[in-house]
Amino acid sequence: HNTTVFQGVAGQSLQVSCPYDSMKHWGRRKAWCRQLGEKGPCQRVVSTHNLWLLSFLRRWNGSTAITDDTLGGTLTITLRNLQPHDAGLYQCQSLHGSEADTLRKVLVEVLADPLDHRDAGDLWFPGESESFEDAHVEHSISRSLLEGEIPFPPTS
């Protein structure tokens, strides 16, 4: 697998997409994991809903969300309030039994905010508003965020 680089700005959200063959991975749950070292294990961060038919519902683990468009074949991971320690190598995975297929290897890079906001209003990251369905599958350690609460690029 080639590694795809996704660049996000510190303090903002980063959306990572992992396309896949929807028929080949039909019925399979998905996961997002962080690679520990070059040849180390991939530590699970968050996985899609236990019921595959509800994979479209966003699930949260802390500041990381996952949602799966099983018809279109796109797994989407959102990293909110991106921090320098979030930089690193990750994988999108398709789960079957105790096995996991790698859908995409992702290198997350965290950029300092280059924009100059001295003369501009705050910029806020584009975010989808949380729906009731999303909220009830969030892990207890995450909190509901008001729309516009996630910072978008500040300016330098």
Epitope: T4, V5, F6, Q7, G8, V9, Q12, Q15, V16, S17, E109, L111, P114, L115, D116, A120, G121, D122, L123, W124, F125, P126, G127, E128, G148, F152, P153, T155, S156
Partner: antibody, heavy 120, light 108 residues
């Protein structure tokens, strides 16, 4: 498919204003930043500013501060760039461009460009 | 403002040859903040490379980017007829984001 369609060419007199539109289609309008970049005839590219279609917040290049205004209409998935106090040096092709998910400050999908001519 | 200087201004090569384009920044730019574009006459630019070395979606692997600090390079390993165009580098390390003056790759 994903595309940005811009309004047609404009001819303006010095001191006037111009408003260029950029209609997005084929993707979720509020999930991607839109930038404006211009190119004078036979010249290079110049970044003007950025708008977040979700909240409407903006950041402009200092050179254009006070003269440029970027707005959006989410009901029509359209972004607007208005440039005032036009002078002959503003004669250029104006492009709107979308930032990809992979990197928020580069431009992967571009409009076809709008030629703005400033002449007395 | 970070000034980007591209060289050479024009590069005359034949199809199949290797093209090496240079972009020099007036101050150090992290490699994460540099992009390359291709522009053909009458068309909008096309994103080739971001983060100095990551190819954008759909870009052939004959295009590669490298460099860090103040010196960056775009390499086209084997020129195809459709590669003859103007190439621009862009930095996004600081506002305003700026572009180089461009390098024209023409058929020899």
């Amino acid at each position: 498919q994903v595309q940005l369609v811009q309004s047609g060419a404009e001819v303006k007199k010095p001191g006037a204003s111009v408003k260029v539109s950029c209609k997005a289609s084929g993707y979720t309008f509020t999930s991607y930043y839109i930038h404006w970049v211009r190119q004078a005839p036979g010249q290079g590219l110049e970044w003007m500013g950025i708008i977040n279609p979700s909240g409407g917040s903006t950041s402009y290049a200092q050179k254009f501060q006070g003269r440029v205004t970027m707005t959006r209409d989410t009901s029509t998935s359209t972004v607007y760039m208005e440039l005032s106090s036009l002078r002959s040096e503003d004669t250029a092709v104006y492009y709107c461009a979308r930032a990809p998910q992979e990197s928020p400050y580069v431009f992967d999908i571009w409009g076809q460009g709008t030629m703005v001519t400033v002449s007395s | 403002e970070i000034v980007l200087t591209q060289s050479p201004g024009t590069l005359s090569l034949s199809p199949g040859e290797r093209a090496t384009l240079s972009c020099r920044a007036s101050q150090s730019v992290s490699s994460s903040y540099l992009a390359w574009y291709q522009q053909k006459p009458g068309q909008a630019p096309r994103l080739l490379i971001y983060g100095a070395s990551s190819r954008a979606t759909g870009i052939p692997d004959r295009f590669s980017g490298s460099g860090s600090g103040t010196d960056f390079t775009l390499t086209i390993s084997r020129l195809e007829p459709e590669d003859f165009a103007v190439y621009y580098c862009q930095q996004y390390a600081g506002s305003p984001f700026t572009f180089g003056g461009g390098t024209k790759v023409e058929i020899k």
